[in-house]
């Protein structure tokens, strides 16, 4: 369930663009970064996919947005919301946020100036 967020620029346009792209590779890439070879991600079905491929696919998907720079924050917020319930503790939430904010740099995009990743009523 998507909640309403304040965004820079045309929010409905960004929402449509974020809805169109597949954010799963980004979610999987970040979970793999954080958890690596640990058993917790067995059910996540990413052992079969090379970690570098997930990173590349993530960047490719984000690049599919017509205005990647302007809609980046919306995409990061959506990833956070999608994964919030999977994050087991406060430390993991912080690590996930740190990785999310680093995603534009990993993909060689400009980072959003401000992006509030507090979602799900403060749970994340």
């Amino acid at each position: 369930m998507r909640r309403e967020r304040g965004r820079q620029g045309d929010s409905s346009s960004c929402e449509r663009q974020v809805d169109r792209v597949n954010l799963k590779p980004c979610e999987q890439h970040i979970m793999q970064r954080i958890m690596g070879e640990q058993e917790q991600y067995d059910s996540y079905d990413i052992r079969s996919t090379r970690s570098s491929d997930q990173q590349q696919r993530c960047c490719d998907e984000l690049n599919e947005m017509e205005n990647t720079q302007r809609c980046m924050c919306e995409a990061l917020q959506q990833i956070m919301e999608n994964q919030c319930d999977r994050l087991q503790d406060r430390q993991m939430v912080q690590q996930f946020k740190r990785e999310l904010m680093n995603l534009p740099q990993q993909c060689n995009f400009r980072a959003p100036q401000r992006c509030d990743l507090d979602v799900s009523g403060g749970r994340c």
């Epitope: 970064r33 954080i34 958890m35 690596g36 070879e37 640990q38 090379r50 970690s51 570098s52 491929d53 990173q55 590349q56 960047c59 690590q95 740190r98 990785e99 904010m101 680093n102 740099q105 990993q106 993909c107 060689n108």
Partner: antibody, heavy 122, light 107 residues
Framework: QLQLQESGPGLVKPSETLSLTCTVS??????????WSWIRQPPGKGLEWIGS???????YSNPSLKSRVTMSVDTPKRQFSLRLSSVTAADTAVYYC??????????????WGQGTRVTVSS | EIVLTQSPATLSLSPGERATLSCRAS??????LAWYQQRPGQAPRLLIY???KRATDTPARFSGSGSGTDFNLTIASLEPEDFAVYYC?????????FGGGTKVEIK
């Protein structure tokens, strides 16, 4: 300018455990996209990747060494460590610590320590 | 695991000559290949990443090319300080591997 410095004993007895520490200066160890790594070079031979560890504790090791390798990271101290158990003369090498950058557009060891020579001998 | 084979093992050339070093990946390494230079008694240093991009401080005489399975490092005109050992390294997936190295020596 970020620098890496290896430290540890230069001589280890066969069957014992080799322990090395790398200290990171002028950078935080918990920066995303950086894997803190160990590489070794036996005398007169090429480079061999030992393993890499992320600030979260996520680690990857060379399959040929994995059963003997333990890596850890101490974020507040800006240090990461390597332990290699049951050493033999074949583990005699110069051991380097290095930073591995893992971006989509840059995947490489961009910063290296000067290396520390470890000899396994009784 | 990707195996990297470098050739030749040794390259004997004179200053001013052109050097071409080869690195073959099996299976494919995509474009995720880096080249390092190691001078005697020193740690390796990054020269080229992403197969063809020069690292900071890498002189323009060094260039990288290739993708997939075949990669080359070219030194357009050898300077005295270029006589060293060169290693390729991949990262299309873990584990990371290095090639066996090519020594560029003075003829």
């Amino acid at each position: 300018q970020l620098q890496l410095q290896e430290s540890g004993p230069g001589l280890v007895k066969p069957s014992e455990t080799l322990s090395l520490t790398c200290t990171v200066s002028d950078a935080s160890i918990d920066t995303p996209s950086y894997f803190w790594s160990w590489i070794r070079q036996p005398p007169g031979k090429g480079l061999e990747w030992i393993g890499s560890i992320y600030y979260t504790g996520n680690k990857y090791s060379n399959p040929s060494l994995k059963s003997r390798v333990t890596m850890s990271v101490d974020t507040p101290k800006r240090q990461f460590s390597l332990r290699l158990s049951s050493v033999t003369a074949a583990d005699t090498a110069v051991y380097y610590c290095a930073r591995y950058v893992d971006y989509v557009w840059l995947r490489a060891f961009d910063i290296w320590g000067q290396g520390t020579r470890v000899t396994v001998s009784s | 695991e990707i195996v990297l084979t470098q050739s030749p093992a040794t390259l004997s050339l004179s200053p001013g000559e052109r050097a071409t070093l080869s690195c073959r990946a099996s299976p494919s390494a995509g474009r995720f290949l880096a080249w390092y230079q190691q001078r005697p008694g020193q740690a390796p240093r990054l020269l080229i990443y992403d197969a063809s991009k020069r690292a900071t401080d890498t002189p323009a005489r060094f260039s990288g090319s290739g993708s997939g399975t075949d990669f080359n490092l070219t030194i357009a005109s050898l300077e005295p300080e270029d006589f060293a050992v060169y290693y390729c390294q991949h990262r299309s997936n873990w584990p990371l591997t290095f090639g066996g190295g090519t020594k560029v020596e003075i003829k």
